[in-house]
């Protein structure tokens, strides 16, 4: 028995070949002997049943001369899954058609971090097929009647070429995924005390009509609980602020990409935030983490102090040095002090390996007096 695979809604070609490679009489029937179509010696396609009943069935007249008499079934339905019989040259050939339906849950437009389940459904009780989907960038996901793709990323967007294999017979279909998300999952902003801070939240996709609402929650390092800094609405590319905290006095750009400005980096703002964006007609939310590290350099009571506040990595080093002098290195990464600093220009650096994350300079004029 020959097996043919077909996807619901598409077309399938069931083969029937003459051993003599020339035109001959043939008939295609259902397994219950009902006639579908055939050729009875005059080179004319004869259909069985009413035209409306068999308007989806056809053959390739151009192939008959070569001894090929395929049965073409268009707009495949699940109930087309059955055995078809081709009668020619006093023999019968059975062809098994397996029609499958592909469903995507929850759909092909998803949010970053969500999962997609691809399910193959069929009326026939076939053994497990192999389903394999390949992204144009090379990523491959495989399964059987159920294929799962978890923790989707923006990079998983675009066209996937999928193949269903059963008894060495293949059928392919395509799917276009659209994974909505932020360009970056996380970002860190390094600022000296008093500098203006800009947070940017660019989306990694372009949608003409985008509606939703968002909020930035902030957990300051020095605070016991997090606080909502701003809430906003999004309609197309238009951003409108609903509510903003009085301290800090944040400003938000009125159009995409999402952008926030903090007038000054102050020690009490150092910490991390989570911007969430809920999109209309989508379950779940998009998230982007943002971190603020603030550096403060001050001279007080004959001691020069450099301090960083906010989420720093253990690999980071804080150094305080005067030009042409040996550096004072912080052991605890976050504070370094020099007692009775010499007059002159001092520099504080926050670095990770050989990369300087930020630096701040202070002019020590005399003991107890300074100028940044």
């Amino acid at each position: 028995k020959t097996l043919v695979l077909g996807k619901e809604g598409e077309s399938a070609e069931l083969p029937c070949e003459s051993s003599q490679k020339k035109i001959t009489v043939f008939t295609w029937k259902f397994s219950d002997q009902r006639k579908i179509l055939g050729q009875h010696g005059k080179g004319v396609l004869i259909r069985g049943g009413s035209p409306s009943q068999f308007d989806r069935f056809d053959s390739k007249k151009g192939a008959w001369e070569k001894g090929s008499f395929p049965l073409i079934i268009n707009k495949l339905k699940m109930e087309d899954s059955q055995t078809y019989i081709c009668e020619l040259e006093n023999r019968k050939e059975e062809v098994e058609l397996w029609v499958f339906k592909v469903t995507f849950s929850p759909g092909t437009s998803l949010l970053q971090g969500q999962s997609l389940t691809l399910t193959l459904d069929s009326n026939s009780k076939v053994s497990n097929p192999l389903t394999e989907c390949k992204h144009k960038k090379g990523k491959v996901v495989s399964g059987s009647k159920v294929l799962s793709m978890s923790n989707l990323r923006v990079q998983d967007s675009d066209f996937w070429n999928c193949t269903v294999t059963l008894d060495q017979k293949k059928n392919w279909f395509g799917m276009t995924l659209s994974v909505l998300g932020f360009q970056k999952a996380s970002s860190i902003v390094y600022k000296k005390e008093g500098e203006q801070v800009e947070f940017s939240f660019p989306l990694a996709f372009t949608v003409e009509k985008l509606t939703g609402s968002g909020e930035l929650w902030w957990q300051a390092e020095r605070a016991s609980s997090s606080k909502s800094w701003i809430t906003f609405d999004l309609k197309n590319k238009e951003v409108s602020v609903k509510r903003v905290t009085q301290d800090p006095k944040l400003q938000m750009g009125k159009k995409l990409p999402l952008h926030l400005t903090l007038p000054q980096a102050l020690p009490q703002y150092a910490g991390s935030g989570n911007l969430t964006l809920a999109l209309e007609a989508k379950t779940g939310k998009l998230h982007q983490e943002v971190n603020l590290v603030v550096m403060k350099v001050a001279q007080l009571n004959n001691t020069l102090t450099c301090e960083v506040m906010g989420p720093t990595s253990p690999k980071m080093r804080l150094t305080l040095k005067q030009e042409n002098q040996e550096a004072r290195v912080s052991e605890e990464q976050k504070v370094v002090q020099v007692v009775a600093p010499e007059t002159g220009l001092w520099q504080c650096l926050l670095s990770e390996g050989d990369k300087v994350k930020m630096d701040s300079r202070i002019q020590v004029l005399s003991r107890g007096v300074n100028q940044t």
Epitope: Q196, E198, K237, E238, G253, K254, K255, P263
Partner: antibody, heavy 118, light 107 residues
Framework: EVQLLESGGGLVQPGGSLRLSCSAS????????MSWVRQAPGKGLDWVSS????????YHADSVKGRFTISRDNSKNTLYLQMSSLRDEDTAVYYC???????????WGKGTTVTVSS | AIQMTQSPSSLSASVGDRVTITCRAS??????LGWYQQKPGKAPKFLIS???SLQSGVPSRFSGSGYGTDFTLTISSLQPEDFATYYC?????????FGQGTKVEIK
């Protein structure tokens, strides 16, 4: 062709009220942000107010907050500016402007003159 | 509100001159800045959006640049029809704010 035509300007006494209108044509009015910008005699441009077509949100300059109200009637393709408690410093040419898809004021009317004087 | 400081407030130049007008924002505004040209008794004309994007129909002698707080409008070779007042507008957030204007006069 996109066109904006302001009307309703005139002479009004301090403390008085006036309603400006801006009739729009040549584009889908309800899709766009519309604004009022004014220019006092011999002075620069001064943004007064904006209203979103999508959300209906309104925005006003601090100098007119509580005195001026921007509104729109999408069925009539008309933008309004209701001005009350008028002051001498409100004397200006008032322009109606349409935002483009990138939210910049790209098309302006010819303006209507408002004179506040006793 | 974001303040926009435009300089110079006026300048005298000749036809063919290269003219540069600057605009500084009191805080970062990305590239959300527009430039407008206004002639006496006329409505402003939109020249440049997003700091550097020339509007259709605007001659290529006009160009804009900048990001954050500092922006520039340049007219590479001044033509007689370019004598006018030029305004920058911050379109980052409400309230929208204009620069005070730069009047370009004939020398």
């Amino acid at each position: 062709e996109v066109q904006l035509l302001e009307s309703g300007g005139g002479l009004v006494q301090p403390g008085g009220s006036l309603r400006l209108s801006c009739s729009a044509s040549g584009f889908t009015f309800s899709d766009y942000v519309m604004s009022w910008v004014r220019q006092a005699p011999g002075k620069g441009l001064d943004w007064v107010s904006s209203i979103s077509g999508l959300t209906g949100n309104t925005y006003h300059a601090d100098s007119v907050k509580g005195r001026f109200t921007i509104s729109r009637d999408n069925s009539k393709n008309t933008l309004y500016l209701q001005m009350s408690s008028l002051r001498d410093e409100d004397t200006a040419v008032y322009y109606c402007a349409k935002d483009n898809e990138d939210y910049y004021m790209d098309v302006w009317g010819k303006g209507t003159t408002v004179t506040v004087s006793s | 509100a974001i303040q926009m400081t435009q300089s110079p407030s006026s300048l005298s130049a000749s036809v063919g001159d290269r003219v540069t007008i600057t605009c500084r924002a009191s805080q970062g505004i990305r590239n959300d800045l527009g430039w407008y040209q206004q002639k006496p008794g006329k409505a402003p004309k939109f020249l440049i959006s997003a700091a550097s994007s020339l509007q259709s129909g605007v001659p290529s002698r006009f160009s804009g640049s900048g990001y954050g707080t500092d922006f520039t409008l340049t007219i590479s070779s001044l033509q007689p029809e370019d004598f006018a007042t030029y305004y920058c507008l911050q379109d980052y957030t409400y309230p929208r704010t204009f620069g005070q204007g730069t009047k370009v006069e004939i020398k």
